[in-house]
Interface confidence: medium
């Protein structure tokens, strides 16, 4: 089976405050089985932004139908962006287990927030 790659093609995304940000992430293999999660930041202080298996995440919607078994697109849209949302976002694949364990991370996408146009 093909080795899993987590593709985050955008190095950075710039969005005006109040707008929505789309963060792209696709995977190249359905294996291993397990959820995708999005985090802002890395290391112990990282913040969970979206978990495929939990919720709700009121400001976050998935771009495609992530409940479909064959889905490989885990891009998300974050609405009503504020300066507090700035940071690097990582799309991370977890391996199913008790508990789920981190398997592979994307390279990250840096979100910068511009002032709201007057």
């Amino acid at each position: 089976e093909e080795e899993l790659q987590i593709i985050q093609p955008d190095k950075s995304v710039s969005v005006a405050a109040g707008e929505s940000a789309i963060l792209h992430c696709t995977i190249t293999s359905l294996f291993p089985v397990g959820p995708i999660q999005w985090f802002r930041g890395a290391g112990p202080a990282r913040v969970l932004i979206y978990n495929q298996r939990q919720g709700p995440f009121p400001r976050v919607t998935t771009v495609s139908e992530t409940t479909k078994r064959e889905n490989m697109d885990f891009s998300i849209s974050i609405s009503n962006i504020t300066p507090a949302d700035a940071g690097t976002y990582y799309c991370i694949k977890f391996r199913k287990g008790s508990p789920d364990t981190e398997f592979k991370s994307g390279a990250g996408t840096e979100l910068s927030v511009r002032a709201k146009p007057s």
């Epitope: 790659q5 593709i7 093609p9 955008d10 190095k11 950075s12 995304v13 792209h24 390279a107």
Partner: antibody, heavy 119, light 108 residues
Framework: DVQLVESGGGVVRPGESLRLSCAAS????????MNWVRQAPGEGLEWVSL????????YYADSVKGRFTISRDNSKNTLYLQMNSLRAEDTAVYYC????????????WGLGTLVTVSS | ETVLTQSPGILSLSPGERATLTCRAS??????LAWYQEKPGQAPRLLIY???SRAAGIPDRFSGSGSGTEFTLTISSLQSEDFAVYYC??????????FGGGTKVEIK
């Protein structure tokens, strides 16, 4: 103006080593991801290797993995490609290319340096 | 690995004519596609990125279109300096970053 100037090419025998350099100016080198791309005589462009701005992350084409090493010295604004165990099929013009800040396309290229591997 | 196929391999046209170059991807690269021009003895030059955005300083006779797996580079009216080799490159997939095989635009 952005400038990328490659050097270090030459004629070597199979199995020998060579180190290419790329001197960069006109942009913030230390925050720019950099690449080597090559072109064999009469052939198309082939991506060889990528290094992140900090130098912590590197990628290689399968054809050079384990033989080539990309590195950089941000204090000297210089990119390197150490090429070991060279083969005839490594004969090519080697270009240094700067990645765009947002995406992995190449917004600036050098003129290239020719590496010839021949017995 | 995403494979890019360019066609035709060689395009023979006269100055003033319209050139249409095609690049097909083996899987969707959305609009993460760039076009470059290469001339002998010169550094390759970025023409188009994001499938349709012209790079700085590129004349408006160059235009790009397409998304997903099918892309086109159009040169509306060929000038003498446009006769060169053109490459497409996808940057959606993580490395390896892949190029098409190139299209040579030559004088008829």
């Amino acid at each position: 103006d952005v400038q990328l100037v490659e050097s270090g090419g030459g004629v070597v025998r199979p199995g020998e080593s060579l180190r290419l350099s790329c001197a960069a100016s006109g942009f913030t080198f230390s925050t720019s991801d950099m690449n080597w791309v090559r072109q064999a005589p009469g052939e198309g462009l082939e991506w060889v290797s990528l290094i992140s701005g900090s130098g912590e992350i590197t990628y290689y084409a399968d054809s050079v993995k384990g033989r080539f090493t990309i590195s950089r010295d941000n204090s000297k604004n210089t990119l390197y490609l150490q090429m070991n165990s060279l083969r005839a099929e490594d004969t090519a013009v080697y270009y240094c290319a700067k990645e765009n800040d947002r995406y992995r396309f190449f917004d600036y290229w050098g003129l290239g340096t020719l590496v010839t591997v021949s017995s | 690995e995403t494979v890019l196929t360019q066609s035709p391999g060689i395009l023979s046209l006269s100055p003033g004519e319209r050139a249409t170059l095609t690049c097909r991807a083996s899987q969707s690269v959305y609009t993460y596609l760039a076009w470059y021009q290469e001339k002998p003895g010169q550094a390759p030059r970025l023409l188009i990125y994001g499938a349709s955005s012209r790079a700085a300083g590129i004349p408006d006779r160059f235009s790009g279109s397409g998304s997903g797996t099918e892309f086109t580079l159009t040169i509306s009216s060929l000038q003498s300096e446009d006769f060169a080799v053109y490459y497409c490159q996808q940057y959606y997939d993580r490395p390896p970053l892949t190029f098409g095989g190139g299209t040579k635009v030559e004088i008829k």
